[in-house]
């Protein structure tokens, strides 16, 4: 595989990762697919420092991150352990609220206007942030 040593055009480098900030919205799954087509993933927040960096760039706008509980427990899209990892939920969140009337609960996490996290309906068209790590082999699969 090949290694990425610098960030693509229009991406922002920070602490050996590259970040891309959308300027429009998509449902969580579509945002996830967008990042994957970029050989990236929805942002995974692992520290308060990273939280502040992302928050600075997105401003007071609802923005998807790579955290969901669509299959039961909360999971980060890159496999980072949720239970032992960094969290920044709003008070009384996540609450898997069913009162929105859209069917089901709330299975996808986003940054709220103050940067703290909330769970919401995954179909809502929020902005999103993609992240990819530098110096990580791209793991190009062998051709059969």
């Amino acid at each position: 595989g090949s290694e990425r040593t610098c960030c693509p055009v229009n991406w922002v480098e920070h602490e050996r990762s590259c970040y891309w900030f959308s300027r429009s919205g998509k449902a969580w799954a579509d945002a996830d697919n967008y990042c994957r087509l970029e050989d990236a993933h929805l942002v995974v927040v692992t520290s308060w420092e990273e939280q502040k960096f992302v928050q600075h760039h997105i401003g007071p706008v609802n923005t998807w991150m790579g955290l969901h509980d669509q299959n039961g427990p909360w999971k980060w899209v890159d496999g980072t352990d949720y239970e032992t990892g960094f969290k920044n939920w709003r008070p009384e969140q996540p609450d898997d609220w069913y009162g929105h009337g859209l069917g089901g609960g709330e299975d996808c996490a986003h940054f709220t206007d103050d940067g703290r996290w909330n769970d919401d309906v995954c179909q809502r068209p929020y902005r999103w942030v993609c992240e990819t790590e530098l110096d990580k082999a791209s793991q190009e699969p062998p051709l059969l």
């Epitope: 998509k26 449902a27 087509l37």
Partner: antibody
Amino acid sequence: EVQLLESGGGLVQPGGSLRLSCAASGFTFSSYAMNWVRQAPGKGLEWVSAISGSGGNTFYADSVKGRFTISRDNSKNTLYLQMNSLRAEDTAVYYCAKRVTDYGGNDWFDPWGQGTLVTVSS
Amino acid sequence: DIQMTQSPSSLSASVGDRVTITCRASQSIINYLNWYQQKPGKAPKVLIYTASSLQSGVPSRFSGSGSGTDFTLTISSLQPEDFTTYYCQQSYSTPTFGGGTKVEIE
């Protein structure tokens, strides 16, 4: 100049297999996701499959999932579509197309190759 | 999948006419809408991306507008080379295309 050139089309019997190729030039191939889009004779356009620049992430239309496999060889600047268990309804011109994005999150297909015709018939 | 409905499926017009083609999405796609032109026996070429941005090299007589579910492609003054087929495509979700609009000489 960006160029895409498809090859590998032809006549195949139902249930048969075929592998299409798309040779790319004029851009840094490994930096771009690529797509296959098809068009049945006299019909509209249908997206078939996409693959990320590294080849690590792939996506398929429901109509071809489990039968078609998209892949790429970045050392050869070539995109592939392996088509198995072919059906009459897979008859179409198959185009490869480069994925282009804007700063906000939209993406589209530009440019497209000239296409290669796949005919599935007994 | 998001369904894209293009209308009309065909239209007749004359050189110099102003022509409008519409595209309606089955749900809001914000502005994730692209327009392509396809000439017989050729591959499609992008005209408009992100609903209203004109692709480099495309004549300014082509314009796009709309947001949410309803979009339009306008050709302000038809030229002989514009008599061909046009497609819309959404990229909010898994890509889907409209059925096409064939612009014919009246």
